[in-house]
Interface confidence: low
């Protein structure tokens, strides 16, 4: 018979003829021949493969290094690989979990639109036209320029996005 | 496991007072920086206040600062809120969380605080 160009699903070409891809979790020792099955060994300690496979080595698992501020969020096993999670108070850098920073205060000029929780970062906002934030801190809402009218007084110097008004006294016109 | 209880709520006419306690375990208590945060009906979350684990530094939102006093007794795993002079905007459903480097990863069931006359 001919020899085959393409496999099943689950097994793969080599030397003309199909064989089997080695499960998740177990690693390529040998290819298939005429008379012998593929064989796989299962992937060691601290190793793991997630697919159907034809890999002569494992892949380690990752390693949720402490000094970058990871910890173990779940334990590999031989099938999966070991997901990282950052230490409280702290956020993951990118979805892969590499490493963390502590999560951001708002600048000047800007104010929480929502607080940092365990699993996200701050949300800052500008300070929209009418309210102002001169510090920079991981709480602080933009607040509102101080009404110089309800204390009877006159804006003597506007506000900005980063500062009050400032407020003084009416000149009282002469006789 | 974490759990923090608040208690000390309730009925409160404007301009008066209630302290709040909430009673922290399974975890290191004096380790951690502590704080409060309300939910008033139909709104948001908002930040109160919040005290390093020591004790020794606290912040205060602008709408509750020189009426409400933030304090902690490590010996005792407990935190406190002292509120005065409040006011019916400060009606809200009142959250102690524990916190690391100034966020919060647990939070308590909440206690509820009605200023009305």
């Known amino acids: 018979p001919e020899p085959p160009t393409a496999c099943r699903e689950k097994q793969y070409l080599i030397n003309s003829q199909c064989c089997s891809l080695c499960q998740p979790g177990q690693k390529l020792v040998s290819d298939c021949t005429e008379f012998t099955e593929t064989e796989c060994l299962p992937c060691g300690e601290s190793e793991f493969l997630d697919t159907w496979n034809r890999e002569t080595h494992c892949h380690q698992h990752k390693y949720c290094d402490p000094n970058l501020g990871l910890r173990v969020q779940q334990k590999g096993t031989s099938e999966t690989d070991t997901i990282c999670t950052c230490e409280e108070g702290w956020h993951c850098t990118s979805e892969a979990c590499e490493s963390c920073v502590l999560h951001r205060s708002c600048s000047p000029g800007f104010g929480v639109k929502q607080i940092a929780t365990g699993v996200s970062d701050t949300i800052c906002e500008p300070c929209p036209v009418g309210f102002f934030s001169n510090v920079s801190s991981a709480f602080e809402k933009c607040h509102p320029w101080t009404s110089c009218e309800t204390k009877d007084l006159v804006v003597q110097q506007a506000g900005t996005n980063k500062t009050d008004v400032v407020c003084g006294p009416q000149d009282r016109l002469r006789a | 496991e974490v759990q923090l209880l608040e208690s000390g709520g309730g009925l409160v006419q404007p301009g008066g007072s209630l302290r709040l306690s909430c009673a922290a375990s399974?975890?290191?208590?004096?380790?951690?920086?502590m704080h409060w945060v309300r939910q008033a009906p139909g709104k948001g979350l908002e930040w109160v206040s919040s005290?390093?684990?020591?004790?020794?530094?606290?912040y205060y939102a602008d709408s509750v600062k020189g009426r409400f006093t933030i304090s902690r007794d490590n010996s005792k795993n407990t935190l406190y809120l002292q509120m005065n002079s409040l006011r019916a905007e400060d009606t809200a459903v009142y959250y102690c969380?524990?916190?690391?480097?100034?966020?919060?990863?647990?939070w308590g069931q909440g206690t509820l605080v009605t200023v009305s006359s």
């Open positions: 969380a524990k916190g690391h480097s100034w966020t919060f990863d647990y």
């Open positions: 005290i390093d684990s020591r004790g020794s530094v606290t």
């Open positions: 399974g975890f290191t208590f004096l380790s951690y920086p």
